[in-house]
Amino acid sequence: VPGEAEQPAPELVEVEVGSTALLKCGLSQSQGNLSHVDWFSVHKEKRTLIFRVRQGQGQSEPGEYEQRLSLQDRGATLALTQVTPQDERIFLCQGKRPRSQEYRIQLRVYKAPEEPNIQVNPLGIPVNSKEPEEVATCVGRNGYPIPQVIWYKNGRPLKEEKNRVHIQSSQTVESSGLYTLQSILKAQLVKEDKDAQFYCELNYRLPSGNHMKESREVTVPVFYPTEKVWLEVEPVGMLKEGDRVEIRCLADGNPPPHFSISKQNPSTREAEEETTNDNGVLVLEPARKEHSGRYECQGLDLDTMISLLSEPQELLVNYVSDVRVSPAAPERQEGSSLTLTCEAESSQDLEFQWLREETGQVLERGPVLQLHDLKREAGGGYRCVASVPSIPGLNRTQLVNVAIFGPPWMAFKERKVWVKENMVLNLSCEASGHPRPTISWNVNGTASEQDQDPQRVLSTLNVLVTPELLETGVECTASNDLGKNTSILFLELVNLTTLTPDSNTTTGLSTSTASPHTRANSTSTERKLPEPESRG
C-alpha cells in the first residue's frame, strides 16, 4: 500500500487490569464516515474483526471480545470492559466511506504487584564462605508488566558485584496473564552484617505514573567464630541475700559456643563447674553469702573444639548473719538493770537499732541497749534490727523477751458481766507474770488454759449460771512462786429492758465472754502470799 511506511504511531491508551478501556476512533470526518466503521484487534500481525458499526449501530463479532464491547460517544468510542493482560495489543478502526482509512490505538495494560514477600535464609550464612550465599528471597505476585526489583542493605541499594553480590531474578506467568517475580539475593557477608537490615523494593508502572512497594526489613543469621567470652550478672549493682541472681555466659560468636560456668573453690582454689539451667544460665535463688566468690565462663566451639575462657568475675552476695542478742532470755528482778547486746556479721558496715516490740518505738541506735530501774512494764519484747544502710532491704532482726520477776498481774481487777439465768457462761481471765502464772477459779466448771506468751496465760471457764453463782460472783486467781492475785467477775441479771452488749443468745443457749480488751494495766493489785504454801 503506497505510503504505508509513513503510518503515524498508534495512539497510546493506558489502563489497569479489570477496568474499562475507552478506544476512541480518531478518524476525521474527511477520512471516513464514523457511522460505518469496522474495529479490529491486531495480534502477532494478524487482524481479527471484532466489532462493526452500521448507521451508528454497533454489533460484536463472535469471539473473545463478544461480551465485553459496547459503543459509546455516539459511535465514536468503543468501550472494552474487564481488561486483562491479554488485551495488551493494537486495536484499529477502519472507515469504509468515502474511502478506506484506519486509525490505530495501542492498548497498554498495568497491574500493581502485591506487597513483596521477603523470606530470609533460615539456615544462615557463614562469614568465611568462598562465594556469595543465599541471603533472602523476594517474591512479587500478580503484577503486570514484570516489575523491577531493587535490593537494599541498611537503606542503601545493592548492585551486582563480582564474587560479592549476585541478584538472580526469574518470573512466571500465571494463568491470569499476570507475572510473579522471584528474586534471590546472594552475597558474601561479614561479621558486621549480623545486624544488617535487608529489604527488597518492587518498581512498577501504572497509568498514573511510576510506583514502588517495599518489603519488611529482615536480618539474616550470620555465623562467625567466637573471639571472646564473658560473664554477665543480673541484677547489676549491689547484691544481697535473698535476691534472684542470674549469671550468664556471653560470647561474640554466632552460634555461641557451648558454655560452662565454674566457681573457684575457696579451699582448693580449683574451679568447680556449677549446674546451669537449660538456657545455660546459673540461677542463684535465693542468693546466699556462700554464693560469693570468683566465677568464670568457658566457651567450647563444638565444631573446632577450640575453648575460650572469660575473665574471672568476683561476685559478692552481701549478707547480714543471724542476729544474736545476749542475754538471749533475760530474767531480772524489779528495780535492777539490764544490758542487752546485739551482734551480727555482715559483708558491709552495719547499723543497729533497738525497738520496743509492742509499740515499734525506737529506743536506741546502736548495738547496746541499757535498761535501768526495771519496772514490770519493761517486761516483754525488744527487737534488735541490724541493717546495711547502703543496701535497702538488707537487714536481720532478733526478738528478745525480757522477763521481770514478779507475782501475777491481772489484766483486769473487776468486771461486770450481764447474764441470764440457766445460760452457759464463757468467762475468761488473763494474767501475766514471771514465772508464768497458773490460774484457778473459785467455782466448778470446765476450765482450759492457753499460754499467750512466755509470761502470759489465759484461762477460760464454762459455767452454768445458777442463783448461787449470781450471789457469789466468780473469782479467778493467778499464782506463781512469787505471789498471787485475783480478778472478780460480778454477774448481773439481764431484764428485757437492759441493753446487753456483752451477751448474745443463740438457739436458747446464751454465751457471755468476759475477757480483757486491753493489755494488763495498773489497776491490778499484787498480794504477797500470806504464808508459804506447798503445791505439787
Epitope: 532470755a329 520477776f405 512462786d481 506447798s534
Partner: antibody, heavy 118, light 111 residues
C-alpha cells in the same frame, strides 16, 4: 564466784532418814530457784523438787511427795532436802542446781553420794 | 508427764566429725516462740553442765561448735566439729510443765 556445794551424803540403812544440805554463794540466793536432781549409778538424771527461797514455795515430783521435804535457811543461804524411809532404789548422786523462771539449770553443785544399803 | 526420747542412745564418732543428737518430747514443749528444751553435757564423775537453753541459745562460755534447734516436739543438738573434750554423755531436759524430765542420755564415744 557462783557456787553450790552439797553435803550430808553417805551410807544409810533402808528405812532410815538423811538430810542433805546445799550451800549457795556468789549470787542473791532469794532471787533464784534451787532444785534437787538425782542420778542413780549408771542411769540418767531425775528431777526431784524445787524451792523458791524468796517465798519458800516448793514443788515436788509426785514420785517423791510425802517422802522428801525441802526447806531453806535464808540467813545461811542453805537449802535442805530431808529424805525419809529410804530404800535401795534411792541410791544416787544428789545434785542441787540453780535456775531462773524458765527452769533450766545453769549452775550445779558437784553432787553428794547417797547409798542406801543394809 | 512429758516423756523425752533421745536418739541415738550411744554414738561413735571421730575428732572433726559433725554429730547430731535428737530429742523428741511426747507433747509440745513450745509456747509462742519459746521452746522449753535444754541440753546438758556430763562427763564421768562430774555434774552436768548447761550447753543450750530454750532450744537454741548457747550458754555463756560454751564453744560455738555446739548449736541447738527445733520446736514443738522435735529438737536437735549439733556439734559441728567434734573435739577430744566433747566425748561425754548428753541429756535433753524440758521445763514446759511439772515434773521436769530428762532424756535417757546419749553417750558419745571415740571411734
Amino acid at each position: 564466784q557462783v557456787q553450790l556445794v552439797e553435803s550430808g551424803g553417805g551410807v544409810v540403812q533402808p528405812g532410815r532418814s538423811l538430810r542433805l544440805s546445799c550451800a549457795a554463794s556468789g549470787f542473791t540466793f532469794s532471787n533464784y530457784w534451787i532444785h534437787w536432781v538425782r542420778q542413780a549409778p549408771g542411769k540418767g538424771l531425775e528431777w526431784v523438787a524445787r524451792i523458791y527461797p524468796g517465798t519458800d514455795i516448793t514443788y515436788y515430783n509426785e514420785k517423791f511427795k510425802g517422802k522428801f521435804t525441802l526447806s531453806v535457811d535464808n540467813s545461811k543461804n542453805t537449802l535442805y532436802l530431808q529424805m525419809n524411809s529410804l530404800r535401795a532404789e534411792d541410791t544416787a548422786v544428789y545434785y542441787c542446781a540453780r535456775s531462773g523462771g524458765y527452769w533450766y539449770f545453769d549452775v550445779w553443785g558437784a553432787g553428794t553420794m547417797v547409798t542406801v544399803s543394809s | 508427764d512429758i516423756q523425752m526420747t533421745q536418739s541415738p542412745s550411744s554414738l561413735s564418732a571421730s575428732v572433726g566429725d559433725r554429730v547430731t543428737i535428737t530429742c523428741r518430747a511426747s507433747k509440745s514443749v513450745s509456747i509462742s516462740g519459746y521452746s522449753y528444751m535444754h541440753w546438758y553435757q556430763q562427763k564421768p564423775g562430774k555434774a552436768p553442765k548447761l550447753l543450750i537453753y530454750l532450744a537454741s541459745n548457747l550458754e555463756s562460755g560454751v564453744p560455738s561448735r555446739f548449736s541447738g534447734s527445733g520446736s514443738g516436739t522435735d529438737f536437735t543438738l549439733t556439734i559441728s566439729s567434734l573435739q577430744p573434750e566433747d566425748f561425754a554423755t548428753y541429756y535433753c531436759q524440758h521445763s514446759r510443765e511439772l515434773p521436769y524430765t530428762f532424756g535417757q542420755g546419749t553417750k558419745l564415744e571415740i571411734k
